[in-house]
């Protein structure tokens, strides 16, 4: 569910939302760390209805959710949760 990509692209998010999306309606979360042409961290959420939204990284709900997902992955998977794609 939780992925981190390092890309050489500029910022992907034009607009960010802080509107809560429950875990049950999220298909995938992609994290784009700042750098490589974008000065800010970006979080992209794929919803189960096939729509995509950029989420404000400061939104409390996404921070809590990512923490839960990190804990969940570290306790159930022998490999780290982050997938790194190096360009």
């Amino acid at each position: 569910v939780l992925e981190v990509y390092y890309t050489s692209l500029r910022c992907r998010c034009v607009q960010e939302s802080s509107v809560f999306i429950p875990r049950r309606f999220i298909d995938r979360i992609q994290i784009l760390p700042r750098g490589n042409g974008c000065p800010r961290k970006e979080i992209i959420v794929w919803k189960k209805n096939k729509s995509i939204v950029c989420v404000d990284p400061q939104a409390e709900w996404i921070q809590r959710m990512m923490e839960v997902l990190r804990k969940r992955s570290s306790s159930t998977l022998p490999v780290p949760v982050f997938k790194r794609k190096i360009p």
Epitope: V19, F20, R24, N49, S51, T76
Partner: antibody, heavy 123, light 106 residues
């Protein structure tokens, strides 16, 4: 006191359409996502649809996707379910239920339910 | 899709008995499970969410436990008003209800 009152159920032929309504009161309707859940006679509960607080997002299980459409009118405190291409297996009591608080971050499930409206699909 | 296997499907017990119902998820759902009570001709009533969090006004004789895939719902001392059908619900990935447990008077 939270109140949810469903209406619009009835007898419809296979292939027909029906629109259910749910009137909400006793809470700030526009702050909550809402869902429809159904129960076939003598059977268990089955989730049918959910719509976000602002109405921009809707979610469905595969067996109703493309046939059912959930919508809402926050100005009227009303929730709707448009059901098309109805089948015999859609026969059930349909409940509307209050879902998660859209302005929060607590992932809570459906908490308050209406008394339901019966939809019978038969020729 | 996540499947929820609830057992038993029916149960006979007496007032004062301790009753346990289980739900098993087909995959890890963390703690995202709720329990509902439904009486004939009535709407379901939420008793517990997030595995063990009791809804306001629900008596403390109701409790829940578990995590991952295995969950338990317990009524510590059955009261006459507790005879009903109980359903579990997973809300980690969309929604799936268990098949229900009908609790009857012995």
């Amino acid at each position: 006191e939270v109140q949810l009152v469903e209406s619009g159920g009835g007898l419809v032929q296979p292939g027909g359409s029906l629109r259910l309504s749910c009137a909400a009161s006793g809470f700030t309707f526009s702050s909550y996502a809402m869902s429809w859940v159904r129960q076939a006679p003598g059977k268990g509960l089955e989730w049918v649809a959910t719509i976000s607080d602002g109405g921009s997002d809707a979610y469905y299980p595969d067996n109703v996707k493309g046939r059912f459409t959930i919508s809402r009118d926050n100005a009227k405190n009303s929730l709707y379910l448009q059901m098309n291409s109805l089948r015999a297996e859609d026969t059930a009591v349909y409940y509307c239920a209050r879902d998660y608080y859209g302005s929060g971050y607590e992932d809570s499930p459906m908490d308050y339910w209406g008394q339901g409206t019966l939809v019978t699909v038969s020729s | 899709d996540i499947q929820m296997t609830q057992s038993p499907s029916s149960l006979s017990a007496s007032v004062g008995d301790r009753v346990t119902i289980t739900c098993k998820a087909s995959q890890d759902i963390n703690k995202y499970i709720a329990w509902y009570q439904q009486k004939p001709g009535k709407a379901p009533k939420l008793l517990i969410h997030y595995t063990s969090t009791l809804q306001p006004g629900i008596p403390s004789r109701f409790s829940g436990s578990g995590s991952g895939t295995d969950f338990t719902f317990t009524i510590s001392s059955l009261q006459p008003e507790d005879f009903a059908t109980y359903y579990c619900l997973q809300y980690d990935n969309l929604y799936t209800f268990g098949g229900g447990t009908k609790l009857e008077i012995k």
